[in-house]
Interface confidence: low
């Protein structure tokens, strides 16, 4: 008798590994014999598709070599014209051992930046990714994180982060390891020990020391008054990523000596500079040599301080006056990084106007010194504490800064703006009045040696500082 089809063995979920065989069984009882068709995700599987084998009158579907794209719902449908068609469905879950699809690569990174080592994986179940540094599992912390993708992100890279890394992808079917990659951390050149300034007698020998570090180890070059050192001998030694350079000089004239440490990061260079002055005790150059010329300021350090297009005096006792004076200011400004926010802008204005003095053009270009009142205002109001410390260090022979040797004028020797208003230069950036001074906490035990008047503010001022208003 004719009998409608009945599926006696419903399809079940099949787990299969990639490249292995997977079989679905769809046992059917019926008369006459049914026609059995198969679908994957509701799309008909064609009988002639060579990736499949359909046997046992269609009751057996075999996937000959499973691919990860084969996962889905497989259904068999049986129909013999008696009654309705019957269907049974089951899922194929493609299991896959972990595979690293984008392995990490060697990375060179500058200290302080962010490094990312890629590690993209595939597998089913989804692999968990961990990292090994050297021989130990890598611990995550506030800087170091394994991202969702498996990549390793290191914020604010430190020297200690350098080393060999590999990622590990793991699931229930197995483990995959990436090749070992190297994270190299490069560090900008930095001066550990700056050369010290010296005041020596004519004909002395002086050795200037400069120590620097960085990764790769920097090279050190010496500059004398803006030019490469022409005389003197240089000795160098390198130990534990620290380079020590010693420049021995026979002193016949004063000079500004700059140690420049440089290292290379890819196509870019990083540079650190430190300068020292060599002055000669009782050195007095003949007046005819002590000349200079007027020129517009073209440097960077004093841009915000000097009036726009200011004419400044460039001292030709330096081989390259612009470079030498700029270096002097640069070095002095570095000293100012540690002073109070009240003192710093005032001291910067004083330094810039003292080293790049206003220039009076004429047959003989003449530098115009700062007015005494402004100098005293900086010394005894804005920077009283700092000045006291500096003078104390000077007396004890501890102070080796450009700020002392070249960059700070002796206020009492400067002309007063009350004597001849054209004989001295005013600092437009020190704009304060008596009201401010009244509220300003006393910083000195002694009174100013000159009354500080209401100083006129200048229209060219690019910022103003009052002792009661901190600027950083």
């Amino acid at each position: 008798l004719p009998k409608a089809p009945v599926i006696t063995t419903p399809l079940e979920t099949v787990d299969a590994l990639v490249e292995e065989v997977a079989t679905f069984m769809c046992a059917v009882e019926s008369y006459p014999q049914p026609e059995i068709s198969w679908t994957r995700n509701k799309i008909l599987i064609k009988l002639f598709d060579t990736r499949y084998s359909i046997r046992e009158n269609g009751q057996l579907l075999t996937i000959l070599s499973v691919e990860d794209s084969d996962d889905g719902i497989y259904c068999c449908t049986a129909n013999n014209g008696v009654g309705g068609a019957v269907e049974s469905c089951g899922a194929l879950q493609v299991k896959m051992k972990p595979k690293i699809t984008r392995p990490p690569i060697n990375v060179k990174i500058i200290e302080g930046l962010k490094a990312v080592l890629p590690c993209t994986t595939m597998g089913n179940p989804k692999p968990s990714v961990s990292w090994i540094k050297g021989d130990s599992p890598l611990r995550e912390n506030s800087r170091i994180a394994v991202l969702e993708s498996g990549s390793l992100r290191i914020h604010n890279v430190q020297k200690e982060d350098a080393g060999q890394y590999r990622c590990v992808a793991k699931n229930s079917l197995g483990t995959a390891y990436s090749k070992v990659v190297k994270l190299e951390v490069e560090v900008f050149a930095r001066i550990l020990r700056a050369p010290e300034s010296h005041n020596v007698t004519f004909g002395s020998f002086v050795t200037l020391h400069c120590t620097a570090t960085g990764i790769p180890v920097p090279t050190i070059t010496w500059i004398e008054n803006g030019n490469a050192v022409s005389s003197g001998s240089i000795q160098e030694s390198v130990k534990d990523r620290v380079i020590d350079s010693r420049l021995q000089l026979f002193i016949t004239k004063p000079g500004l000596y700059t140690c420049i440490a440089t290292n290379k990061h890819g196509e870019k260079f990083s540079t650190a500079k430190a300068a020292a002055t060599i002055s000669i005790a009782e050195w007095s150059k003949p007046q005819k040599d002590n000349k200079g010329y007027c020129a517009q300021y073209r440097g960077e350090v004093c841009n915000a301080v000097l009036a726009k297009d200011a004419l400044v005096f460039l001292n030709t006792s330096y081989a390259d006056p612009e470079e030498a004076q700029e270096l002097l200011v640069h070095t002095a400004w570095n000293e100012l990084k540690v002073v109070s926010p009240v003192c710093r802008p005032a001291a910067e204005a004083l330094l810039c106007n003292h080293i790049f003095q206003e220039c009076s053009p004429g047959v003989v270009p003449t530098p115009i010194p700062i007015c005494r009142e402004y100098c005293l205002a900086v010394k005894e109001l804005f920077c009283a504490k700092e000045w006291l410390v500096m003078e104390e260090k000077t007396h004890r022979g501890l102070y080796r800064s450009e700020m002392h040797l070249l960059s700070v004028p002796e206020c009492s020797k400067l002309p007063s703006m009350h004597w001849d208003p054209t004989a001295c230069a005013r600092l437009p950036h020190l704009d304060y009045n008596k009201e401010n001074l009244k509220t300003f906490p006393p910083m000195t035990s002694s009174k100013p040696s000159v009354d500080i008047p209401n100083l006129p503010s200048s229209s060219s001022s690019s910022f103003s500082v009052s002792p009661t208003y901190s600027m950083t």
């Epitope: 699809t101 984008r102 962010k114 993209t120 506030s142 994180a145 991202l147 969702e148 914020h155």
Partner: antibody
């Protein structure tokens, strides 16, 4: 300053393959992900995929079966191929640099319009 | 895929007035490292998109400080403190947490 420039045919026939190239100038192609993003007229942005300079790729699953990306570091170029195109693939195609320091597309090309039509 | 939803889709603003655009993600964009993987882009008329804000709240270089990004997890906001005529265009949020990166449908800012 790094600049990106897309190039390729503006008209592609249905069922054919769309091919675009992005040229990186003013900087190195190394150490970045390079991305393709498209925008059908009057619609939003769709991320197509990205390629790293080593050649490894990530594609949008919705386009994965049709997308191929490649990179030629010697020419500072990367390319997109999209096969079996239909009218739905008509869009402005942008190449962009994915800066993984900022996790963002920081530099974009000006875009090239591709029309799929017979 | 992570679905990004922006509101409003259209935003008429008077110059000088503030503006605010909301973006919501279908799952949290806050990673355990503390960063929110959400970027904001502006596409001015006839131009390609340009980056405004990355990692939720960091202004890209050259972006005026009237633009600010805030929010965490699934809810984010782009604020313009004082809208200028040059700010018109379509603003998109984008999640950078997962592949595929997905964008919001865009908010069209126009001047009243």
């Amino acid at each position: 300053q790094v600049q990106l420039q897309e190039s390729g045919p503006g008209l592609v026939k249905p069922s054919e393959t769309l091919s675009l190239t992005c040229t990186v100038s003013g900087g190195s192609i190394s150490s970045y992900y390079w991305t393709w993003i498209r925008q059908p007229a009057g619609k939003g942005l769709e991320w197509i995929g990205r390629i790293y300079t080593s050649g490894s790729t990530d594609y949008n699953p919705s386009l994965k079966s049709r997308v191929t990306m490649s990179v030629d570091t010697s020419k500072n170029q990367f390319s997109l191929k999209l096969s079996s195109v239909t009218a739905a693939d008509t869009a402005v195609y942008y190449c962009a640099r994915y800066n993984w320091n900022d996790d963002a597309f920081d530099i974009w090309g000006q875009g090239t319009m591709v029309t799929v039509s017979s | 895929d992570i679905v990004m939803t922006q509101s409003p889709l259209s935003l008429p603003v008077t110059p000088g007035e503030p503006a605010s655009i909301s973006c919501r993600s279908s799952q949290s964009l806050l990673h355990r490292n503390g960063y929110n993987y959400l970027d904001w882009y502006l596409q001015k008329p006839g131009q390609s998109p340009q980056l405004l804000i990355y990692l939720g709240s960091n202004r890209a270089s050259g972006v005026p400080d009237r633009f600010s990004g805030s929010g965490s997890g699934t809810d984010f906001t782009l604020k313009i403190s004082r809208v200028e005529a040059e700010d018109v265009g379509i603003y998109y949020c984008m999640q950078a947490l997962q592949i595929p990166h997905t964008f919001g449908q865009g908010t069209k800012l126009e001047i009243k």
